[in-house]
């Protein structure tokens, strides 16, 4: 069902695995990190080189896009169903262009169903990427270029690019434009995690991963 189950079934090597939706036979391919922090992590987002366009539609963010071996978005529907079955933690791993790494760990993470636009719910932040959550709390509805559910007259997803849980527009967007080194500062629409690197810094790499809290 998820990478934690795959791990527990004896598959302890990083790689792409076929997962199934809860209470369904529908399948989805995901990258499983079986080494970091004890393994069993389902990767739900990865940015690393700008090879994939993240300015996608609501339907694309719903079902997922990209390549699990590289840059990709796993899909809001799968993540919503998974995280409403049991308690999950969310770990966000970040890299800047100067060789630094940081993370934010939320001890409870889930997405509402599509009915409430995959609204994000987070509790219990720890980690090195800021003492304040760069995902606005309480959580907001997900927005895309064709689904404007934010709290700004500016249409955050169109202005900042990418689908995200925008507020107005808020202190983060890990699905923003990918900017290469030396072009990554003073970018309002880049890959942003405000409480680590500030507002204009666009990150080199990001990974969002989830795992059952009782793993």
């Amino acid at each position: 069902r998820d990478c934690a189950e795959v791990f527990k079934s004896g598959h302890t090597t990083n790689g792409i695995y076929t997962l199934t939706f809860p209470n369904s036979t529908e399948e989805i391919k995901a990258y499983c990190d079986m080494e970091a922090g004890g393994g069993g992590w389902t990767i739900i987002q990865r940015r690393e080189d700008g090879s994939v366009d993240f300015q996608r539609t609501w339907k694309e963010y719903k079902v997922g896009f990209g390549n699990p071996s590289g840059e990709y978005w796993l899909g809001n529907e799968f993540v919503s169903q998974l995280t409403n079955q049991q308690r999950y933690v969310l770990k966000i791993h970040l890299k800047d262009w100067e060789g630094n790494e940081a993370y934010s760990l939320y001890e409870h993470f889930y997405l509402s169903s599509e009915e409430l636009n995959y609204r994000i719910h987070l509790k219990g932040l720890t980690g090195t990427a800021g003492k304040i959550s760069s995902i606005s709390q309480p959580g907001n509805d997900f927005s895309t270029k064709d689904g404007d559910n934010d709290k700004c007259i500016c249409k955050c997803s169109q202005m900042l690019t990418g689908g995200w849980w925008f507020d107005a527009c808020g202190p983060s967007n890990l699905n923003g434009m990918y900017y290469p080194q030396r072009q990554n500062t003073n970018k309002f629409n880049g890959i942003k995690w405000y409480y680590w690197k500030g507002s204009g810094y666009s990150l080199k790499a990001t990974t969002m991963m989830i795992r059952p809290a009782d793993f």
Epitope: L116, P138, D146, G147, N149
Partner: antibody, heavy 120, light 107 residues
Amino acid sequence: QVQLVESGGDVVQPGRSLRLSCAASGFTFSSYGMHWVRQAPGKGLEWVAIIWYDGSNKYYADSVKGRFTISRDNSKNTLYLQMNSLRVEDTAVYSCARDFSISSRHFDYWGQGTLVTVSS
Amino acid sequence: DIQMTQSPSSLSASVGDRVTITCRASQAINNYLAWFQQKPGKAPKSLIYATSNLQSGVPSQFSGSGSGTDYTLTISSLQPEDFATYYCQQYYIYPITFGQGTRLEIK
């Protein structure tokens, strides 16, 4: 400019059916969610239902669930509300409203409404 | 369901007055709040969404504020065309619900 024009309102007996229509113009209909909202005579506003831009999701108020069906025909730029098993308490002016986006749950434009009277 | 309670239910004011209408939700709604204006026999007009964002074409004498469960609509200087009934609406969760309305009359 955005225009929403409802039709189909009538006087009907309890238990009967009625279908309301909302003709939309002045915008790309297929890019927006649409709602039905009603207002009983001398009363406040009550949300009835929403349909997403592509018809993929529909949600209803408990008071109409199982009796009313919202639908749309994007090729005709028209929204519908099929009302079955009508009750006296369904008497109201029914208005269609455009969602701010595909599913934001708030509205930016409303129609004038069409009156449905359920009476024996 | 989330109950929305508006106050006052009616008020009288004069042209040029500053008027405040409040709306209280039965639970926190995280700024998912809109305001509408309705005149007799007319369709409601959307004024504000997400607590404080003015809809396109809405005059600047209207403003909104609030957080958690308590929200406010302010008309800074009443114009003759502002006399109407005002409704708040929460869209934090389904079902979408409205306040009972505030009738603003000429004194």
